[in-house]
């Protein structure tokens, strides 16, 4: 009866998510065989969440609505650990949007999901920012630096990278 | 007072190349992205390139790419379009004009008078 | 590319009168509350003018008869009455994104 009734909260919290995702893979966490986490097919897992590369080119603000009706916000980038996971599937020669800008143009930058932004946790490359009417920020790779970030302009089409938060059954 | 002067234009046959330039005064030049647009004649308008500040980052529509290239001078507060493997459909007023932001976007608010480049044989 | 369609192609109106165009855009051009469309207006042989930003924000300068409204993919540009140096051409553009784009224009002349 328990087994069942976890079942059937699990075929409700899939219903949920199938509009956008009609598939997820799940893996177990820990040890209880009824703790399953869950990330599309076929975005990557990184800790507690999950991330997906959206390889059409499109300006930040379409970016950010893109990832948003995919339950899911342009990426916010809280440690080394986490950017050293995503550039794993990064390619190079392009550029992808995160979810940082400033649209004020005051260098007040700021992230998608209202994460404070902190100074001591940024990886631009050396020089960056440094133009105010560039109020997006991209991550890419410069053959002196490797990967890092740089300011360009909003409605320049870029790649982009969507996070959303685990899916927990 | 804004002032943008291009010069420049002229006529060119198909295939040819030309460099435009557009010098500007009345703002501190160094600090503006700068956008090229033109009009064919007795046509709408068309944006053709875009150039930060720095000079670091250029932007072009399709229909030019690989043709034309944007530069600027920030010591001569000068910006400049050079214009290769010109066709016939490139004739037109080429404007050079400032560019504002506006939160995620833009405005283009001050424009020069513009030059006229016209592609024959 | 965001498509642009402005309507009427001309627009006569008799002087104190209203003048009203119309643009649509292919997609949306909103976010967070903004949108990016701007309006320009250009007389015979001379530049564009910036009138109208952000699709409601009056450019400084520009006299108020001239307003902006409208949101998502339906914009429109109001001349509330109609004076003899406002005969020109008059063009939405989009900064959403790249490629910018502009209407096709709407020709106002005095009826």
């Known amino acids: 009866n328990f087994m069942y009734s976890k079942t059937v909260k699990r075929l409700s919290k899939l219903r949920e998510y199938q509009q956008y995702h009609p598939s997820l893979t799940c893996v177990m966490e820990g040890k209880d065989i009824e703790d399953w986490s869950c990330c599309p097919t076929p975005w990557t897992s990184f800790q507690s969440s999950c991330y997906f590369i959206s390889t059409g080119m499109q300006s930040w603000t379409k970016s950010q609505k893109n990832c948003s009706v995919m339950g899911a916000d342009l990426v916010v980038i809280n440690t080394r650990e986490e950017q050293d996971f995503i550039i794993q599937n990064l390619k190079r020669n392009s550029s992808y949007f995160l979810g940082l800008s400033d649209p004020g143009g005051r260098r007040h930058w700021q992230w998608v999901d209202q994460t404070p932004y902190n100074e001591n946790v940024t990886f631009w490359h050396s020089g960056e920012p440094n133009n105010l009417d560039e109020r997006c920020a991209i991550i890419n790779f410069r053959s002196s630096e490797e990967w890092g970030w740089n300011d360009i302009h909003c409605h320049v089409p870029q790649k982009s990278i969507c996070k959303m938060k685990k899916i927990y059954i | 007072e804004v002032q943008l002067l291009e010069s420049g234009g002229g006529l060119v046959q198909p295939g040819g190349s030309l460099r435009l330039s557009c010098a500007a005064s009345g703002f501190t030049f160094s600090t503006y992205t700068m956008s090229w647009v033109r009009q064919a004649p007795g046509k709408g308008l068309e944006w053709v390139a875009t150039?930060?500040?720095?000079?670091?980052?250029?932007y072009y529509p399709d229909s030019v790419k690989g043709r034309f290239t944007i530069s600027r001078d920030n010591s001569k507060n000068t910006l400049y379009l050079q214009m290769n493997s010109l066709r016939a459909e490139d004739t037109a007023v080429y404007y050079c004009?400032?560019?504002?932001?506006?939160?995620?976007?833009?405005?283009?608010?001050?424009w020069g008078q513009g030059t006229t480049v016209t592609v024959s044989s | 590319d965001i498509v642009l369609t402005q309507s009427p192609d001309s627009l006569a109106v008799s002087l104190g009168e209203r003048a009203t165009i119309n643009c649509k855009a292919s997609q949306s051009v909103d976010y967070d509350g903004n949108s990016y469309v701007n309006w320009y207006q250009q007389k015979p042989g001379q530049p564009p003018k910036l009138l109208i930003y952000g699709a409601s924000n009056l450019e400084s300068g520009i006299p108020d008869r001239f307003s902006g409204s409208g949101s998502g993919t339906d914009f429109t540009l109001t001349i509330s009455s109609l004076q003899a140096e406002d005969v020109a051409v008059y063009y939405c553009?989009?900064?959403?994104?790249?490629?910018?784009?502009f209407g096709g224009g709407t020709k106002v002349e005095i009826k």
């Open positions: 004009a400032t560019y504002r932001p506006y939160y995620y976007g833009s405005v283009l608010d001050y």
């Open positions: 553009q989009q900064s959403d994104e790249d490629p910018w784009t």
């Open positions: 150039i930060n500040s720095g000079g670091d980052n250029t």
